[in-house]
Interface confidence: low
């Protein structure tokens, strides 16, 4: 299709080399067309071209995005050759920064509803460059946290070094919707609620003698509770002794609750004490089994292929730790009475003999 009739917009992404950040392009189609395409289409199923793999017109992605190669080659679709670029409705999301994102991006309606729509397209010329570190040491992050229930603010990273008085007029979007209430370089939130979480975009215009550019930055805002003041607590095992059958497999589960921490580095491990020896056990990875705003429950299992006599003399210890402190829970194994016949006992003794040899050759003192 002919792109010479597309409206043109110039954008600048000055990314920080110190942090991960995203970028978003909006398909700013002229208003009458936009209302068609950025909401559910009202076309009947019979009007859907048969090459589109959707059974229902409401499932159609509303706009199609292309990238224009600088060498004049034909337009490229944003394909899986750009795995870091995601299309969603009327937006194009860049997951990683880099000058290789520089280029021209064109969007147009996926479906043409009237002859006037044929020329309905937008060309966005995107320039991407690293922000000079010298320009501002304390620029706002592209990931900002708001403490639930308190007052907070969201700053536009590209303008956070300027005072409110110096700041140009800023246009803010939240999750793709225009926020018309504020035009300054930061949004002040009187009381933070969960719904303040989301993807914020701030735009301002920068002009030079030749042309004007929209400078854009994207901020991921998360609403959080305050960091915990408690060390983790172990929910399971509760009992310090566990009845077991010799020669049978056994799984002991350790579950612990970790309070929210902005920088979360939970530690959860199993170790075994045997007389004066102590060593950490190689066990399956810990997994998060429940995660809420306030805390996270993490589980890690220790698996014994067969319980031996030696295991009855050992102590199994679950150790958990966060930045506040650590907690442990010890478990002693106790043989179930009347659980096995002579064969079981002989088998268990045989296993124990093999394990003793393995133990002596493989285990060392825990430091």
């Amino acid at each position: 299709f002919n792109i010479s009739g597309c409206s043109t917009k110039k954008l600048l992404w000055a990314y920080s080399t110190r942090s991960e950040e995203e970028f978003i392009l909006f398909c700013d189609l002229p208003e009458p067309q936009k209302s068609h395409f950025c909401h559910r289409s009202q076309l009947s199923p019979t009007q859907v071209p048969d090459h589109l793999p959707f059974t229902d017109s409401k499932d159609l992605p509303d706009v199609q995005w292309y990238r224009q190669p600088s060498n004049g080659d034909p337009l490229e679709d944003i394909r899986k050759s750009y795995p870091h670029i995601i299309q969603d409705k009327c937006t194009l999301r860049f997951l990683t920064p880099g000058v290789n994102n520089t280029g021209s991006y064109i969007c147009r309606p996926k479906m043409i509803k009237s002859p006037y729509d044929v020329a309905c397209c937008v060309k966005m010329i995107l320039e991407v460059k690293p922000q000079s570190n010298a320009s501002c040491e304390n620029s706002a992050s592209h990931k900002q946290d708001l403490l639930l229930g308190s007052t907070g603010s969201i700053s536009c990273p590209s303008l956070s070094c300027q005072s409110d008085a110096q700041s140009p007029e800023v246009t803010w979007y939240k999750n793709g919707k225009l926020l018309s209430m504020t035009r300054s370089n930061r949004i002040v939130v009187d009381e933070v609620y969960i719904y303040h979480q989301g993807t914020y975009v701030c735009d301002y215009t920068q002009s030079d003698t030749a042309s004007s550019w929209t400078v854009r930055a994207v901020v991921q805002v998360r609403t959080i509770v305050g960091d915990t003041k408690l060390k983790p607590d172990i929910l399971d095992p509760v009992e310090s002794t566990l009845e077991v059958e010799l020669g049978k497999p056994l799984t002991i589960s350790c579950k612990a609750r970790f309070g929210f921490e902005r920088v979360f580095n939970p530690v959860m491990k199993w170790y075994i004490k045997d007389a004066d020896l102590e060593w950490e056990v190689s066990v399956p990875e810990a997994k998060s089994i429940k995660s809420t705003l306030k805390d996270e429950i993490i589980e890690r299992n220790i698996i014994l292929e067969k319980v031996t006599q030696r295991d009855l003399r050992r102590t199994f210890v679950c150790f958990v730790q966060n930045s506040i402190g650590n907690t442990t829970q010890s478990v002693q194994l106790k043989e179930k009475r009347g659980s096995g016949g002579l064969n079981d006992i002989f088998e268990a003794q045989k296993i124990e003999w093999h394990e003793t040899v393995r133990f002596q050759s493989h285990h060392h003192h825990h430091h």
């Epitope: 071209p49 048969d50 090459h51 589109l52 793999p53 959707f54 059974t55 409401k58 499932d59 992605p61 199609q64 995005w65 679709d77 944003i78 394909r79 899986k80 795995p83 995601i86 299309q87 969603d88 999301r93």
Partner: antibody
Framework: QVQLQQSGPGLVKPSETLSLTCTVS????????WSWIRQPPGKGLEWIGY???????NYNPSLKSRVTISVDTSKNQFSLKLSSVTAADTAVYYC??????????????????WGQGTTVTVSS | AIQLTQSPSSLSASVGDRVTITCRAS??????LAWYQQKPGKAPKLLIY???SLESGVPSRFSGSGSGTDFTLTISSLQPEDFATYYC?????????FGQGTRLEIK
């Protein structure tokens, strides 16, 4: 990296509703399509349907009248309900993430991350 | 619905062999085809998408080709871990459909 954890009962009685949930960890449920696929014992794979995080769905016509797929973005999970089950619905059920590939005239989706699978037996 | 027919249904080969599996679509699907590998008791794993693009992390001995109705998956030099069942999948039109599978066994 993104991981999918499936949960739900392994045994369902005939004529009842099969319910499974898939929890996304290590990434957000947003901006992706999420599918359910099943595999009867010793047989091939059958696509059941997908849901976009916004709630848009598309189902296999062969199952459409009995299937509901829903999403809960706050919990980072999506669910499958299959009503009026019979023995023919006995299968391993998988959830998967669909990665979109936009081609010149079309949108394609391939499943690049899968759940571990849940064996569901329909029996009284 | 578009039907995909894989051949052969099963295949015996040795480590080091070159193996080719074909997938034929009941109507043209452009390049909208993917290949998956499935091992017993495990979920399928994406190998190839868009008929010939190798998924990241997949060894380069796997390759795909074809367009329209005829597609092939080639393993240039079989490794012990390659013995599994392979499925083709079309995503040109809904409903998404899979081939019946090709079981690759050790000779």
């Amino acid at each position: 990296q993104v991981q999918l954890q499936q949960s739900g009962p392994g045994l369902v009685k005939p004529s009842e509703t099969l319910s499974l949930t898939c929890t996304v960890s290590g990434g957000s449920i947003n901006n992706y399509y999420w599918s359910w696929i099943r595999q009867p014992p010793g047989k091939g794979l059958e696509w059941i349907g997908y849901i976009f995080y916004s709630g848009t769905t598309n189902y296999n016509p062969s199952l459409k009248s009995r299937v509901t797929i829903s999403v809960d973005t706050s919990k980072n999970q999506f669910s499958l309900k299959l009503s009026s089950v019979t023995a023919a619905d006995t299968a391993v059920y998988y959830c998967a993430r669909d990665v979109g590939i936009a081609a010149r005239n079309s949108y394609y989706y391939v499943m690049d991350v899968w759940g571990q699978g849940t064996t569901v037996t329909v029996s009284s | 619905a578009i039907q995909l027919t894989q051949s052969p249904s099963s295949l015996s080969a040795s480590v080091g062999d070159r193996v080719t599996i074909t997938c034929r679509a009941s109507q043209g699907i452009s390049s909208a085809l993917a290949w998956y590998q499935q091992k017993p008791g495990k979920a399928p794993k994406l190998l190839i998408y868009d008929a010939s693009s190798l998924e990241s992390g997949v060894p380069s001995r796997f390759s795909g080709s074809g367009s329209g109705t005829d597609f092939t998956l080639t393993i240039s030099s079989l490794q012990p871990e390659d013995f599994a069942t392979y499925y083709c999948q079309q995503f040109n039109s809904y409903p998404i459909t899979f081939g019946q599978g090709t079981r690759l066994e050790i000779k």
